[in-house]
């Protein structure tokens, strides 16, 4: 039975040209995290394998930095980066947990972080 929950940074906003940290945290399970995939719609941004470290998709390699931890730092933001991002936790023996973050990239300098929320 899958008992875990993923806590994410929720709905967040950031300035164009700036950077943002995408973070998820898996709790309430003793399952072992084998890999975390970071995806945006149909695109793979990066993978963090617990043993083999990071794989960064070449289309993002100049704008993505691994970490902190299992998170991902997205740099040099453009308005085209607005959208849904998913952290997909591959765990053993539970299986897959998915968290969702919505990022809005703003033209203005008024960019406030949204509240954290949980996805069961």
């Amino acid at each position: 039975m899958m008992t875990g929950t993923i806590e994410t940074t929720g709905n967040i906003s950031a300035e164009k040209g700036g950077s943002i940290i995408l973070q998820c945290h898996l709790s309430s399970t003793t399952a072992q995290v084998t890999q975390v995939n970071w995806e945006q719609q149909d695109q793979l941004l990066a993978i963090c394998n617990a043993d083999l470290g990071w794989h960064i998709s070449p289309s993002f390699k100049d704008r993505v930095a691994p970490g902190p931890g299992l998170g991902l730092t997205l740099q040099s933001l453009t308005v085209n980066d607005t959208g849904e991002y998913f952290c997909i936790y591959h765990t053993y023996p539970d299986g897959t947990y998915t968290g969702r973050i919505f990022l809005e990239v703003l033209e203005s300098s008024v960019a406030e972080h949204g509240a954290r929320f949980q996805i069961p």
Partner: antibody, heavy 119, light 107 residues
């Protein structure tokens, strides 16, 4: 120039063990994952596992876990794969292959080591 | 484990032809697919990574495309030296797996 030089062919008896080496040069050994791949005669490729030399992280294909052991000697920039309890099914060519920088695909391959298991 | 199916074990072609080799994944692997060329008696050689990126030094007649579950490797104008076995590989999740291979041969 990046080079991966593997040890020579091996002829061993069923039930025995073998240790294949992969001596590297031309790059910073600890910065790149080393993968090991099996190719049975005339067949496809099978990923055995990968090892990240900087932190010792190892990922095994469950099919080989318990019989295969991956290791490195950072002082000599050499990767090793030991395979135990050998059977005729293990007769194959074994490759070491360097994982590309911040990627999981393999951009440089050793020349292969032919293992024959026969009594 | 993710299964990669290369439906054609053999493909016949002529020098100068355009040829496409397909690879189908048993589940969504986004763009985490590489293509390797293996000539007889040699080690595999990386041609394409992340579905569509050409490895350093690979001629531009080689291209890769696709995402999700369906991938294609194309040689625009086959040369005699392209006769080899071509394998796809997924690196979306461990264990990393390879396709069964497609052998390109002359008609």
């Amino acid at each position: 120039e990046v080079q991966l030089q593997q040890s020579g062919p091996e002829l061993v008896k069923p039930g025995a063990s073998v240790k294949i080496s992969c001596k590297t040069s031309g790059y910073t050994f600890t910065e790149f994952t080393m993968h090991w791949v099996k190719q049975s005669h005339g067949k496809s490729l099978e990923w055995i596992g990968g090892l990240k030399p900087d932190n010792g992280g190892i990922s095994y294909n469950q099919k080989f876990k318990g019989r295969a052991t991956l290791a490195v000697d950072k002082s000599s920039n050499t990767a090793y794969m030991e395979l135990r309890s050998l059977t005729s099914e293990d007769s194959a060519v074994y490759y070491c292959a360097r994982g590309a920088y911040y990627r999981y695909d393999a951009d440089y391959w050793g020349q292969g080591t032919t293992l024959t298991v026969s009594s | 484990d993710i299964v990669l199916t290369q439906s054609h074990k053999f493909m016949s072609t002529s020098v100068g032809d355009r040829v496409s080799i397909t690879c189908k994944a048993s589940q969504d692997v986004k763009t985490a697919v590489a293509w390797y060329q293996q000539k007889s008696g040699q080690s595999p050689k990386l041609l394409i990574y992340s579905a569509s990126y050409r490895n350093t030094g690979v001629p531009d007649r080689f291209t890769g495309s696709g995402s999700g579950t369906d991938f294609t490797f194309t040689i625009d104008s086959v040369q005699a030296e392209d006769l080899a076995v071509y394998f796809c590989q997924q690196h979306y999740s461990t264990p990393f797996t390879f396709g069964t291979g497609t052998k390109l041969e002359l008609k």
